[in-house]
């Protein structure tokens, strides 16, 4: 039975040209995390494998950085980065847990700065 839950940064906003940390946390389970995939729609941004470390997809290598922890840092944000992001936790023996984050990239300097994990 899958007992775990994923906490995420939820809905967050950031300024165009800035950076943001996407962060998820799996709790309430003793399952072993074997891999975390970060995705945007049908695009795979990155994989963090428990044994092998990080793989950033070549399409995103120039503006995605691994971490902190199992999180992902998006840099040089553009308005086109607005949208849904997913953290997919592959675990044993539970299976797969999915967390959702909505990022809004704003043109002006009116981005909210209250979100946890955000880089000023």
């Amino acid at each position: 039975m899958m007992t775990g839950t994923i906490e995420t940064t939820g809905n967050i906003s950031a300024e165009k040209g800035g950076s943001i940390i996407l962060q998820c946390h799996l709790s309430s389970t003793t399952a072993q995390v074997t891999q975390v995939n970060w995705e945007q729609q049908d695009q795979l941004l990155a994989i963090c494998n428990a044994d092998l470390g990080w793989h950033i997809s070549p399409s995103f290598k120039d503006r995605v950085a691994p971490g902190p922890g199992l999180g992902l840092t998006l840099q040089s944000l553009t308005v086109n980065d607005t949208g849904e992001y997913f953290c997919i936790y592959h675990t044993y023996p539970d299976g797969t847990y999915t967390g959702r984050i909505f990022l809004e990239v704003l043109e002006s300097s009116v981005a909210e700065h209250g979100a946890r994990f955000q880089i000023p």
């Epitope: 995939n37 049908d42 994989i47 997809s57």
Partner: antibody, heavy 120, light 107 residues
Framework: EVQLQESGPGLVKPSETLSLTCAVS????????WNWIRQPPGKGLEWIGY???????YYNPSLKSRVTISRDTSKNQFSLKLSSVTAADTAVYYC??????????????WGQGTTVTVSS | DIVMTQSPDSLAVSLGERATINCKAS??????VAWYQQKPGQSPKLMIY???YRYTGVPDRFSGSGSGTDFTLTISSLQAEDVAVYYC?????????FGGGTKVEIK
């Protein structure tokens, strides 16, 4: 350049243990991931498992109960043991390197392969 | 496990013509797909990774496309040295799995 060379007996009796070694030159096995992949005669490829740069192992669940992958860093080699073999384990066995950081789970260097036949 | 299904099983194409190989994943694997070429009596060689990126030294007549569940390897102008079996592989999640292979021959 990375070079991998498999060695071991070409004939193994049913119920016995298949043992193969992969000698690596031109690269340290304390970096990247070192894999075993097999190909039954006239069939496709099956990934057996890996040993990581840190010595952690992951095995294909379909073979997990019978597989052990180990390494000898002083000799820069890694090994495969497959117990309780049957005719279905007859295959060409490849050792291979995987540079997870750059290519994800895509295997970029392969040994030449060694044929193992299970027969009494 | 994720099943990778290739089609067709074999393909005969005239020299200089286009060869197209398809691979379908049993679930969404985003862009975590690689393609390999295996010539008779040889070990496989990495051709494409991350669905569409050519590996070092791979001729530009080889291209990969697709995301989600449907992927394609295209040889734009078949050469005699391209005769081989081609395999797709997913690495979205372990266990990493391969397709059954597509044999490319000259018509």
């Amino acid at each position: 350049e990375v070079q991998l060379q498999e060695s071991g007996p070409g004939l193994v009796k049913p119920s016995e243990t298949l043992s193969l070694t992969c000698a690596v030159s031109g690269y340290s096995i304390t970096s990247d991931s070192w894999n075993w992949i097999r190909q039954p005669p006239g069939k496709g490829l099956e990934w057996i498992g890996y040993i990581s740069y840190s010595g952690n192992t992951y095995y294909n669940p379909s073979l997990k109960s019978r597989v052990t992958i180990s390494r000898d860093t002083s000799k820069n080699q890694f090994s495969l043991k497959l117990s309780s073999v049957t005719a279905a384990d007859t295959a060409v066995y490849y050792c291979a390197r995987l540079d997870f950081s750059n290519y994800g789970g895509a295997v970029d260097y392969w040994g030449q392969g060694t044929t193992v036949t299970v027969s009494s | 496990d994720i099943v990778m299904t290739q089609s067709p099983d074999s393909l005969a194409v005239s020299l200089g013509e286009r060869a197209t190989i398809n691979c379908k994943a049993s679930q969404n694997v985003r862009t975590a797909v690689a393609w390999y070429q295996q010539k008779p009596g040889q070990s496989p060689k990495l051709m494409i990774y991350s669905a569409s990126y050519r590996y070092t030294g791979v001729p530009d007549r080889f291209s990969g496309s697709g995301s989600g569940t449907d992927f394609t390897l295209t040889i734009s102008s078949l050469q005699a040295e391209d005769v081989a079996v081609y395999y797709c592989q997913q690495y979205y999640t372990t266990p990493w799995t391969f397709g059954g292979g597509t044999k490319v021959e000259i018509k």
